[in-house]
Amino acid sequence: GSMGHAPKVGRLIYTAGGYFRQSLSYLEAYNPSDGTWLDLADLQVPRSGLAGCVVGGLLYAVGGRNNSPDGNTDSSALDCYNPMTNQWSPCAPMSVPRNRIGVGVIDGHIYAVGGSHGCIHHNSVERYEPERDEWHLVAPMLTRRIGVGVAVLNRLLYAVGGFDGTNRLNSAECYYPERNEWRMITAMNTIRSGAGVCVLHNCIYAAGGYDGQDQLNSVERYDVETETWTFVAPMKHRRSALGITVHQGRIYVLGGYDGHTFLDSVECYDPDTDTWSEVTRMTSGRSGVGVAVTME
């Protein structure tokens, strides 16, 4: 990536890291308003299976692993990217490495959920306070989950699907920060590990993933009022280990693995028409990216 200053634009979809033949250090940003991609400062260490989020206008890359010809190292790292300076800086590491992690943000705090370290599948969860640059463990999930989808709705943290080391999961659970406890919610209709999970219009969406046999293109959403999961239109491509984010009322899914190919495809879901459309291609195919959108 280039080390010059990034243009000061409004809302971009950032994609960090990923995997194609080895873990990647790319940071690229897509501007949906004009369809262009920006090549930005590389991660200091390549990583895949990471998660991305934005707090206070800064992009954070959390966990993952560096799978390279030199070896394979799960990551406990938290790194912060400043779009104004186009620079990465390290923050305090998590208590344990977490590959195929899920993250969510509540009240400016980053929650790191599940993930794996070697063959250990975590149920542990920890919270990062940017002002103090500190991590603290919170209540563990009821289930060990890697490849877990995480989303925040109404200041509640949802952990959806994943893999517990033995089974891919359709179960989901919800964390209540005030009580510091997890409770199971209605299970999805479909087993999904490595799905893309996000929130749009008071619903939690779970897109794609892997059911233990095949990659999926199906998509379902959870209505917190009715506590039910309902299928919506499927994506055009089957994909697991995909990136997902929401931009201006639409869901974007980026890359992933379809069981044969590392996808460069980016699809966009319009909830008004219940349709998916191909909107762009990433500069190269990859899975296991961390994705987030900058704030206004």
Partner: antibody, heavy 120, light 107 residues
């Protein structure tokens, strides 16, 4: 019946290439992690490479990293090991194996192997 | 890399004997250890996974146990078909590594 059948072995000169195939039947390779393990003549077992069915990520032993490539074609239910820049020390019987979560990623099924001989 | 030190490298035993083979990991591998049996010219066959779980179809005379970083394969009453080479394997961390093997021969 679960079966794995390796093919593609043979005699090759140092610096040469071979592509091994592992045809699976009785199960879908899309549902398992596929590994290659080798055994030099009269020696023990050495793990070589693996591919994850969910993420597509591959792992390699340091001894082969950068020279070997594991891949899978789920439509043919076949895994492959592309071996480039072969060395005398790569001479071995190569086994493909199925590893599943149900058996804690131990190799619960393997083929009969294919012999690769690297010699001038 | 984690080393799996297997002992003995060979042993002689008679049918009906109780046989014990040990693997010591150079660092913690939790219970992520498997045991295999291999006969000449054949592929390895899984006997035990997760240190002590008997794989489907494997006779109950085979058992596995763990004590810290020490792992043991026991054959309670050796049968003629058990004369073979046995390997342990750790899959706790990358790269997966095998013990050097133990050849069980007829006394």
């Amino acid at each position: 019946e679960v079966q794995l059948v390796e093919s593609g072995g043979g005699l090759v000169q140092p610096g040469g290439s071979l592509r091994l195939s592992c045809a699976a039947s009785g199960f879908a390779i899309s549902a398992s992690s596929i590994h290659w393990v080798r055994q030099a003549p009269g020696k023990g077992l050495e793990w070589v490479a693996s591919i994850d069915p969910e993420t597509g990520e591959t792992l390699y032993a340091k001894s082969v990293a950068g020279r070997f490539t594991i891949s899978a074609d789920t439509s043919k239910n076949t895994a492959y090991l592309q071996m480039n820049s072969l060395r005398a020390e790569d001479t071995a019987v190569y086994y493909c194996a199925r590893c599943r979560a149900a058996s804690a990623y131990a190799a619960d099924a393997a083929g009969q192997g294919t012999l690769v001989t690297v010699s001038s | 890399d984690i080393q799996m030190t297997q002992s003995p490298s060979s042993l002689s035993a008679s049918v009906g004997d109780r046989v014990t083979i040990t693997c010591r990991a150079s660092q913690s591998v939790s219970s992520a250890v498997a045991w295999y049996q291999q006969k000449p010219g054949k592929a390895p066959k899984l006997l035990i996974y997760s240190a002590s779980s008997l794989y489907s179809g494997v006779p109950s005379r085979f058992s596995g146990s763990r004590s810290g970083t020490d792992f043991t394969l026991t054959i309670s009453s050796l049968q003629p078909e058990d004369f073979a080479t046995y390997y342990c394997q750790q899959s706790y961390s990358f790269p997966s590594t095998f013990g050097q093997g133990t050849k069980v021969e007829i006394k």
